[in-house]
Interface confidence: medium
């Protein structure tokens, strides 16, 4: 969690002086209690918005907008604690307005906004507003919380922001996985314009369980310029293992941006409506390490080799 | 060469957990899963589950499901399994070995023993 | 699950001698079973697997045959090193299993 590193940040308005500042998340008015304190925020809404940075940089932020009830206790807001929690985290980062005059009653409502949180793609935050000061220990709260979902990086938004740009976003690799018989699947898909080795994981399952029953990864060395774009397949080899039916493809890319932690692809190939009857099953080819020379990744239980082309 | 190398022989009481490490070298880790298999005393061999130390997923023989915990750090190259709830029959040398199916390699053996 | 059924459960063979391990399945694992070696206080040692394939290292005396339901271990002339226990595996089906073991001793 960060705020965008842009611009000095801005909390006046017409009839308020404010400021921003950095907080500990832990308000003084949490240490020595008032009397006085003011009533909660009202109406808080949190929205996707897109903020470039000083370098260019597109990402995306939290928008917090909320607006002050119509009571007197707006006679002892000091300012406001805007508090971001990442939920699988926990990791929380709040900044404090605060006020440097007295708000007065005018004809429209009081409202307020921040739009500086950085925010990652794909996760969930909970975002609080603490009106300051601070109730006292058994006073009624005064803050307001909602959870806030970021869309990942397949929503087209997000698609061209630059975290999901620097994992790869912009590939699209069109992956189509086709049941040659029995024993073999074929994978195609689309390289993109990088140098760069990609990894495919082919996890098969039985036909309604989740745990996987048989897990073999193939490696595809980087391609050359001129197959930039173009398609490429390979033929993986499966293990003839009882009810292991279900078969899912992920494609992993290795990136310069990414490197191990690029966005992956997979597609699912399921069970036979009908299970056929069975084939023999060819002589098994060795499911050790080649004593010499494959430049082929044997996951677990490989039994067969996988070969990849690259078509113009 | 290929190696895995377990920690060493723990005494627990009955109800306590053990977790048993695994570190593996000489081969790129996560290129392969690992299976982990226990032996009682004068006994056979018995499969507990397995491993992918490249997604994670996990198969766990039935009997030892919601009392087993497979993980894997592959920073270090290391796989582990928790037992959890120990009792008596489960004094035994735990196997750690590579492979999802069938295991090329096998550690030393850590035997585990469970009395009051 | 597929139980797997080891015969005999001790075998007495002089040195030089052939040594045939029989494994039976409770149902068809197809080609997919191991054998392994254990000697006293060791790990496990792979043999042979998918059926009759002899895994690295593994001296040419030792080799596998069998498929569906009936698997055979034969050791054509017994070495000193080989008096151990010996166990089949299928991997067709979940949970993997073990058979009880065949002990091979000196006669």
């Known amino acids: 969690l960060r705020l965008l590193d842009h611009r000095a940040l801005v909390c006046s308005q017409p009839g308020l002086n404010c400021t921003v500042k950095n907080s500990t998340c832990l308000d003084d008015s949490w240490i020595h209690p008032r009397n006085l304190t003011p009533s909660s925020p009202k109406d808080l809404q949190i929205q996707l918005h897109f903020a470039h940075t000083q370098q260019g940089d597109l990402f995306p932020v939290a928008h917090i907008e909320w607006t002050l009830q119509t009571d007197a206790s707006i006679l002892y807001l000091e300012g406001a604690e805007l508090s971001v929690l990442q939920l699988n985290t926990n990791e929380r980062l709040c900044v404090k307005f605060q006020f440097l005059s007295m708000l007065q009653h005018h004809r429209k409502r009081w409202r307020f906004s921040f739009s500086h949180f950085v925010v990652d793609p794909g996760q969930e935050y909970e975002v609080t507003v603490h009106h300051l000061p601070k109730p006292i220990p058994d006073g009624d709260p005064n803050h307001q919380s909602k959870n806030f979902l970021v869309p990942d990086c397949e929503h087209a938004r997000m698609k061209v922001t630059t975290p999901c740009m620097s994992s790869g976003s912009l590939w699209d690799p069109n992956i189509t996985v086709e049941t040659l018989d029995t024993q073999h699947l074929r994978v195609d898909f689309t390289l993109w314009n990088e140098s760069t080795h990609y990894q495919i994981l082919l996890t098969s399952f039985p036909h309604m369980e989740n745990h996987s029953c048989f897990e073999h990864m193939h490696h595809i060395p980087a391609p050359r310029p001129e197959e930039f774009h173009q398609r490429s397949n390979v033929t993986l080899t499966l293990r003839n293992l009882k009810g292991c039916c279900r078969h899912q493809v992920q494609i992993q890319p290795f990136f310069s941006s990414c490197l191990n932690d690029c966005l992956r692809h997979s597609a699912t190939v399921s069970c036979p409506e009908m299970p056929d009857t069975p084939e023999p099953i060819p002589d098994y080819m060795p499911l050790w390490e080649p004593r010499s020379g494959s430049s082929d990744y044997k996951d677990d239980d490989d039994k067969g080799s996988s070969h990849h082309h690259h078509h113009h | 060469q290929v190696q895995l190398v377990q920690s060493g022989a723990e005494v627990k009481k009955p109800g306590a957990s053990v977790k048993v490490s695994c570190k593996a070298s000489?081969?790129?880790?996560?290129?392969?899963?690992i299976s982990w298999v226990r032996q009682a005393p004068g006994q056979g061999l018995e499969w507990m589950g397995w491993?992918?130390?490249?997604?994670?997923?996990?198969n766990y023989a039935q009997k030892l499901q919601g009392r087993v915990t497979m993980t894997t750090d592959t920073s270090t190259s290391t796989a582990y399994m928790e037992l959890r709830s120990l009792r008596s029959d489960d004094t035994a040398v735990y196997y750690c070995?590579?492979?999802?199916?069938?295991?090329?390699?096998w550690g030393q053996g850590t035997l585990v023993t469970v009395s009051s | 699950e597929i139980v797997m059924t080891q015969s005999p459960a001790t075998l007495s063979v002089s040195p030089g001698e052939r040594a045939t391990l029989s494994c039976r399945a409770s149902?068809?694992?197809?080609?997919?079973l191991a054998w392994f070696q254990q000697k006293p206080g060791q790990a496990p040692r792979p043999l042979i697997y998918?059926?009759?394939t002899r895994a690295t290292g593994v001296p040419a005396r030792f080799s596998g045959s069998g498929s569906g339901t009936d698997f055979t271990l034969t050791i054509s002339s017994l070495q000193s090193e080989d008096f151990a226990v010996y166990y089949c595996?299928?991997?067709?089906?979940?949970?993997?299993?073990f058979g009880g073991g065949t002990k091979v001793e000196i006669k």
């Open positions: 070995a590579r492979r999802q199916l069938y295991f090329d390699y």
């Open positions: 000489g081969y790129t880790f996560t290129r392969y899963g």
């Open positions: 491993i992918s130390t490249y997604s994670g997923n996990t």
């Open positions: 149902q068809s694992v197809s080609s997919n």
């Open positions: 998918d059926a009759s």
């Open positions: 595996q299928q991997y067709d089906n979940w949970p993997l299993t």
